[in-house]
Every structure is written in C-alpha cells, then in structure tokens.
C-alpha cells in the first residue's frame, strides 16, 4: 500500500513523500489537528491499527481518517 | 457544465515529441487529482498518467515512465501531458479525465474529455 | 500489477434479455471496482462505482455485485441503446488498471 507521509505539516502540499506500506493489514492514516485560531496541523503515514475518528476539545478538535488504497 | 476538453494530438515520428492539453470547466479544477487514459485503435483502455490536485506528486505505469511527463496549471485549469521518445505503440486516443472519491478510499474517473488522437508513424 | 480479465470478451442478445459481464482479478480488491460504458465512436462513460453504486443518470437496469476477485455487471432487460463496449477498471493498488472489454451487440 502507498501511502503519503509527513509529520506536522501546515499543508497537505507539504504531505507528499510517498511510504511503501509494507505490514498486513497496514492503512494510510491522516491526522488533522486544528487549533482555535490557528493553522491545522497535518500528519500522515501508514498505520496498523488507524480507526477514523473525530475528537473536539476546548482548544480545537482533532479529526484521523483512515484509507486503504494507493494514494488514498 | 463539467467539461474537459483535450487538444494537441496529430502525427507525429517516431522518437519525437508531443504536448497535449485538456482545459476543464465547470468545476474547481485545483481540488482534484486528474490522469491521462489512453486507447489505442480497436482497444481497450490503459491508465497513463496521474497527477494530484496541486501537482506535486505524480505516478506512471512502467510503459511509459521516464517518457511521459503529466503536469497542470491550477491558474489556467489546464492539464498537461508531455510526451517524449514516441513509438508506434503510443498511437492512441488520449482522454484526460476527473478522478472523484466517495469516502476516504473509493474512486472512480468520473468525468472524461472527448480525447485527442496521436499517431506516432515513419 | 493486478491483471483483470473480463469474460466474454463479446457476446450478442435479445432485447428484454437480463445480460451478465463478469470481472476477475488477480488480488484482492475490496470493493474498488468500477464499471465504464463506452458505445460505439464515443467517449467512455462511468457506469457504477464502488462495485454497486449507479451513477448519476445510470439506467436502473444497471447494477454490480461481488467483492474481493469476483465482480458482475448486470442488465437486468436489455435495451437498443445499451450497445456499448463495458469496461471494469480497480482503484485499489497502482498501476490502475482496466479489463480488456466486454462488446454488447443486440440481435
């Protein structure tokens, strides 16, 4: 699986360096946390255990998605 | 309404170069990946070139990698495919088309120009 | 590269008939596949994504089914204008790739 990759990058254009997933049953993971009033950091990679979800927090709100085909 | 529209094509000789383009309308152009498809003369259809929506990452299949270049203008809502050291197995229909996710993995090429045909012959 | 093989590569029938495409891969592909319709001197058209979902303005006559290697498109009564070459394509793992074509003539 090919994933993007990065770690805490303020945009997606920034996340483009392409990681070979190689474990079973790896998923490309995105993690986008925004802070009230500033920019949204973006990390992204392969992960074996990604569960999307979506958290807010009094200080703003971090959102994980997850995907499974190249590129995704 | 969406609508791609390629141009460029024509005959061209072996080992020489071509530059094809595909204006899109109707749609915001710099949020979406797009590929070049092509099909060759009573064939079926082959993937050739992606680009994704800002245009820093691009992929290729082996057949083509190293003499195709696929690049946009997000400005000009144009895509572009560049193409060096022709052979006569590059004749073909090209069609540039949109690529539209549903969900965070699936996607399909939803929307396709008319296509441009290049012949590459002696 | 996942090879995908479409059968039959032709085949002819009767309006009102149900017509079914198949589609196999050689890897697992999930739900990734996508049908396209191509009718004769014209552009290739999405037909159904996600292995079952219609496109917009897609006959409901149309529909997929399967999962993992093995996939169907089927028409479930066939009309004049549904002659057209059908492609299966997966959107799983690079290089993407395309079946080679099933031609659809009605008798």
């Known amino acids: 699986l090919l994933c993007y990759s990065c770690k805490a990058q303020v945009s997606n254009e920034d996340c483009l360096q392409v990681e070979n997933c190689t474990q079973l049953g790896e998923q490309c993971w995105t993690a986008r946390i925004r802070a009230v009033g500033l920019l949204t950091v973006i990390s992204k990679g392969c992960s074996l255990n990604c569960v999307d979800d979506s958290q807010d927090y009094y200080v703003g709100k971090k959102n994980i998605t997850c995907c499974d085909t190249d590129l995704c | 309404q969406v609508q791609l529209v390629e141009s460029g094509g024509g005959l061209v000789k072996p080992g020489g170069s071509l530059r094809l383009s595909c204006a899109a309308s109707g749609f915001t152009f710099s949020s979406y990946s797009m590929s070049w498809i092509r099909q060759a003369p009573g064939k079926g259809l082959e993937w050739v070139s992606y680009?994704?929506?800002?245009?820093?990452?691009?992929f290729y299949p082996d057949t083509v990698k190293g003499r195709f270049t696929i690049s946009r203008d997000n400005a000009k809502n144009s895509l572009y495919l560049q193409m060096n050291s022709l052979r006569a197995e590059d004749t073909a229909v090209y069609y540039c088309?949109?690529?539209?996710?549903?969900?965070?993995?699936?996607?399909?090429?939803?929307?396709w120009g008319q296509g441009t045909t290049v012949t590459v012959s002696s | 590269d996942i090879q995908m093989t479409q059968s039959p590569s032709s085949l002819s029938a009767s309006v009102g008939d149900r017509v079914t495409i198949t589609c196999g891969t050689s890897q697992d592909i999930n739900n990734y596949l996508n049908w396209y319709q191509q009718k004769p001197g014209k552009v290739p058209k999405l037909l159904i994504y996600?292995?079952?979902r219609l496109h917009s303005g897609v006959p409901s006559r149309f529909s997929g089914s399967g999962s993992g290697t093995d996939f169907t498109l089927t028409i479930s009564s066939l009309q004049p204008e549904d002659v057209a070459t059908y492609y299966c394509q997966q959107s799983k793992t690079l290089p993407w790739t395309f079946g080679g074509g099933t031609q659809l003539t009605v008798l």
């Open positions: 996600y292995t079952s």
């Open positions: 680009i994704n929506d800002s245009g820093g990452s691009t």
């Open positions: 088309a949109r690529r539209m996710y549903y969900g965070n993995s699936h996607w399909h090429f939803d929307v």
